[in-house]
């Protein structure tokens, strides 16, 4: 299991249920790099933190998955959590 994957999971598990729901909704509309597709809405909304981490890594790989997760956290006003996630992935 990679460091970035662990860091993503750690961040998502630290969200409240309401925040995790908001994270998924923002993830649906976040601007993506060219060549990447959005995770399908139907699959996304029912996922827990563990499933969502797996899906983020399978869709975007670890490095970009962590960056994308950090950006969505920033969009939610969770800059500190985003910084911790990025620091953990760059250790």
């Amino acid at each position: 299991m990679g460091r970035a994957r662990d860091a993503i999971l750690d961040a998502l598990e630290n969200l409240t249920a309401e925040e995790l729901k908001k994270f998924k909704l923002k993830l649906l509309s976040v601007p993506l790099r060219e060549g990447y597709a959005a995770i399908p809405r139907g699959a996304l909304l029912s996922m827990d933190a563990l499933d969502l981490t797996d899906k983020l890594v399978s869709f975007y790989l670890e490095t970009y998955g962590a960056e994308l997760t950090a950006n969505v956290l920033r969009d939610m006003g969770l800059q500190e959590m985003a910084g911790q996630l990025q620091a953990a992935t760059h250790q």
């Epitope: 923002k26 509309s29 601007p31 920033r74 969009d75 800059q79």
Partner: antibody
Framework: QVQLQQPGTELVKPGASVKLSCRAS?????????????LEWIGNINLSNGRTNYN??FRAMATLTVDKSSSTAYTQLSSLTSEDSAVYYC?????????????WGQGTSVTVSS | NIVMTQYPKSMSLSIGERVTLRCKAS??????VSWYQQKPEQSPKLLIY???NRYTGVPDRFTGSGSATDFILTITSVQAEDLADYHC?????????FGAGTKLELK
């Protein structure tokens, strides 16, 4: 158009405290602007869960709270000096991405004077 | 803390001129930069967010560009109502920080 409601003026004595209010929603920021100066971010509070973030520069003098029942955010500013005479704005972040401050109150002008 | 440096501090210009305002971040802030317009005795108003996204109702003569550390606000043909202070701000990291502002004045 969201309207953030703030009282217009407050006159307080040096060393005293003042509690500013703002009818708002979501993330509410507090921003200080001294006459002829730039903008300084004091901190923010999430009205739905009470999560706060502070600028360390203001942590000792500003306390951010929320009354969910009235959707009102407050900042209590304590031990005020003349340096704290400024306009204090509240602002919301409602745009889904990049966390800008898209709605601003009209500001409360605080004058610290004996 | 991330320092946002704006330049020039002020600009004197004529109506119809093209204006370029610059903002430099002390470290990489991705695209997490916004531009605000503030007229005398008024609250700031959001113009641009995410470095290049025009906010609802903002005229298309305002354009934002840049990423990482260097950002630009361009006004293609300045109008009388554009004479104001312009602030850039970053929302990449706490504390959120703003530049000192650029004042646009009439020549």
């Amino acid at each position: 158009q969201v309207q953030l409601q703030q009282p217009g003026t407050e006159l307080v004595k040096p060393g005293a405290s003042v509690k500013l209010s703002c009818r708002a929603s979501g993330w509410t920021h507090w921003v200080k602007q001294r006459p002829g100066q730039g903008l300084e971010w004091i901190g923010n509070i999430n009205l739905s869960n009470g999560r706060t973030n502070y600028n360390e520069k203001f942590r000792a003098m500003a306390t951010l709270t929320v009354d969910k029942s009235s959707s009102t955010a407050y900042t209590q500013l304590s031990s005020l000096t003349s340096e704290d005479s400024a306009v204090y704005y509240c602002a919301n972040s409602m745009v889904p991405h990049f966390f800008p401050m898209d709605y601003w109150g009209q500001g409360t002008s605080v004058t610290v004077s004996s | 803390n991330i320092v946002m440096t704006q330049y020039p501090k002020s600009m004197s210009l004529s109506i119809g001129e093209r204006v370029t305002l610059r903002c430099k971040a002390s470290e990489n802030v991705g695209s997490y930069v916004s531009w605000y317009q503030q007229k005398p005795e008024q609250s700031p108003k959001l113009l641009i967010y995410g470095a290049s996204n025009r906010y609802t109702g903002v005229p298309d003569r305002f354009t934002g560009s840049g990423s990482a550390t260097d950002f630009i606000l361009t006004i293609t043909s300045v109008q009388a109502e554009d004479l104001a202070d312009y602030h850039c701000g970053q929302s990449y990291n706490y504390p959120l920080t703003f530049g000192a502002g650029t004042k646009l004045e009439l020549k």
